[in-house]
Interface confidence: low
Amino acid sequence: DAHKSEVAHRFKDLGEENFKALVLIAFAQYLQQCPFEDHVKLVNEVTEFAKTCVADESAENCDKSLHTLFGDKLCTVATLRETYGEMADCCAKQEPERNECFLQHKDDNPNLPRLVRPEVDVMCTAFHDNEETFLKKYLYEIARRHPYFYAPELLFFAKRYKAAFTECCQAADKAACLLPKLDELRDEGKASSAKQRLKCASLQKFGERAFKAWAVARLSQRFPKAEFAEVSKLVTDLTKVHTECCHGDLLECADDRADLAKYICENQDSISSKLKECCEKPLLEKSHCIAEVENDEMPADLPSLAADFVESKDVCKNYAEAKDVFLGMFLYEYARRHPDYSVVLLLRLAKTYETTLEKCCAAADPHECYAKVFDEFKPLVEEPQNLIKQNCELFEQLGEYKFQNALLVRYTKKVPQVSTPTLVEVSRNLGKVGSKCCKHPEAKRMPCAEDYLSVVLNQLCVLHEKTPVSDRVTKCCTESLVNRRPCFSALEVDETYVPKEFNAETFTFHADICTLSEKERQIKKQTALVELVKHKPKATKEQLKAVMDDFAAFVEKCCKADDKETCFAEEGKKLVAASQAALGL
């Protein structure tokens, strides 16, 4: 339904607080280097303008699109060219090209200082002194570092962030109360950002059809009692929400997400029996809860899939009449019966089924041709099952840190051209699949593991796209969204790689390593491990293990020494020499 003033419409729907927060997120995700104060000023100007439009929708400029209004506002930033370079050229374009241009300049790895958490007392004082600014700063800092963060979900995180400070700054032991909550928000936030980044990549790189297929599979697993028409309606609405958020249309996205939550709760009887608790919560919690809700129980006595999709004489007729609807029904029926499969596996099965029908429905005897199509599924199902079994065994044997190290070596040998920080970050995240998923029973392992790996490998893909260095990574990332993980799994050692020159500086350590947290110390050691493999890609596991054990002993020894810096200097030289000898460098 058309509104005379889109900005007034969204302001009224969302309310001033959410409107301001979402505009701040939008601006921070576009102009990631701008100071906080500049963004607050822009947001206040947009808000004041929106209020004039609420008062009189016919007022000057109130009929302009949100992209036009926001883009014009962003283009008033005086330092645009010196701060962002060619992004300033976007301002010479007209909508919708201008917004597309801004989107293309979003940076997944912006050059921003690492967020350092201050003392609890500092944070509590800041929170009490100016709660509004403190919370805005949180939105700003997260949004600029995660330019695809799902905006309505970030409002939910901010609400929890505020609740944590409200509660803990009054507690007897503020730190004991607050720090675990902040750790949890940080970890959940990183996971949420990565999951949303995959959704946006799916839409932007592979198109709406790919995203809709993913949504059909996931929602069918989650709501197996809902009928196909209901799932299709939810998929259409969900696709609109994510298309808007990924496109920077955050006000529309948040508004439509609220409408979708309302619809789901009004129709929960025909969707899922698991929604009752979610639907009693306030809006932000409700939407989050629905997105995370557990799978409903499968209906009893579901008939065999073969009847409609293999044995029926109408298979090719039904397929020809409405290909995507028929394939959607196949995906829906298969997914609701298989909560034990990963979404990407279900999509591979649907793709195999589609390819078979394309070939067979043009054959002399279609039925004879596609009669054994379900047999083709067996190896596709067994491949991830076997991989997960092997890797969970390895994880249980090694523990998380050493399992990460095994993956670091594996992936550095596959794609040694990728930057060391990216290899460390991605391999550490890949390694977390162990503690995240291996504890689950068989029936939950694959959806947990393979869908999580899809999220992590997408991080590799988006980081690599910014600075492409490996044809093999580009190939695995771009050929097929659902086959990314099998593509990376199938990569062997890159025989074309010319080993990196040895540089002693890379393996020089100082006393500051002793004061690092366990996690940061692990990252330092894992960085050294990647560099070792880049110098000596043919090194055996045993050689690398020996060097890493020596390295750990060296760090432990020097951190206990009275003169730490001298120990690191002298013992470090010996370690480098011994490592070179051990690896034949």
Epitope: V116, A126, K137
Partner: nanobody, 124 residues
């Protein structure tokens, strides 16, 4: 308002040392996070080090870790930066900064008050 005055800059040879001081007046010093930033000719201002109110936390830029040490004496309303193993690339105007409420120590926009700077030149 808080006034900050830096001192201790000068010319030093590579490998040499200096100790910078920053004296604060006009506020309750012990309630401020204190930071040092620097700006080399033709470059942007960059974070060097910071220290929390009660010296519980210190933070350093990667480029100075292990060489520079930040400390404070709340009884003297002074923050110090000890510069060791100086290199030519450390040449810059060093600024002291104070922040009443900071979320992120390393960001210059978080700091409310700034000194005029003291020049450090590392040259042979």
């Amino acid at each position: 308002d808080v006034q900050l005055v830096e001192s201790g800059g000068g010319v030093v040879q590579p490998g040499g040392s200096l100790r910078l001081s920053c004296a604060a007046s006009g506020g309750t010093f012990s309630t401020y996070v204190m930071g040092w930033f620097r700006q080399a000719p033709g470059k942007e201002r960059e974070f060097v080090a910071a220290i929390s109110q009660n010296s519980i936390h210190t933070y350093y830029a990667d480029s100075v870790k292990g060489r520079f040490t930040i400390s404070r004496d709340n009884s003297k309303n002074t923050v110090y930066l000890q510069l060791n193993s100086l290199r030519p690339e450390d040449t810059a105007l060093y600024y002291c900064a104070a922040s009443r409420f900071t979320s992120w120590y390393t960001a210059d926009y978080e700091y409310d008050y700034w000194g005029q700077g003291t020049l450090v030149t590392v040259s042979s």
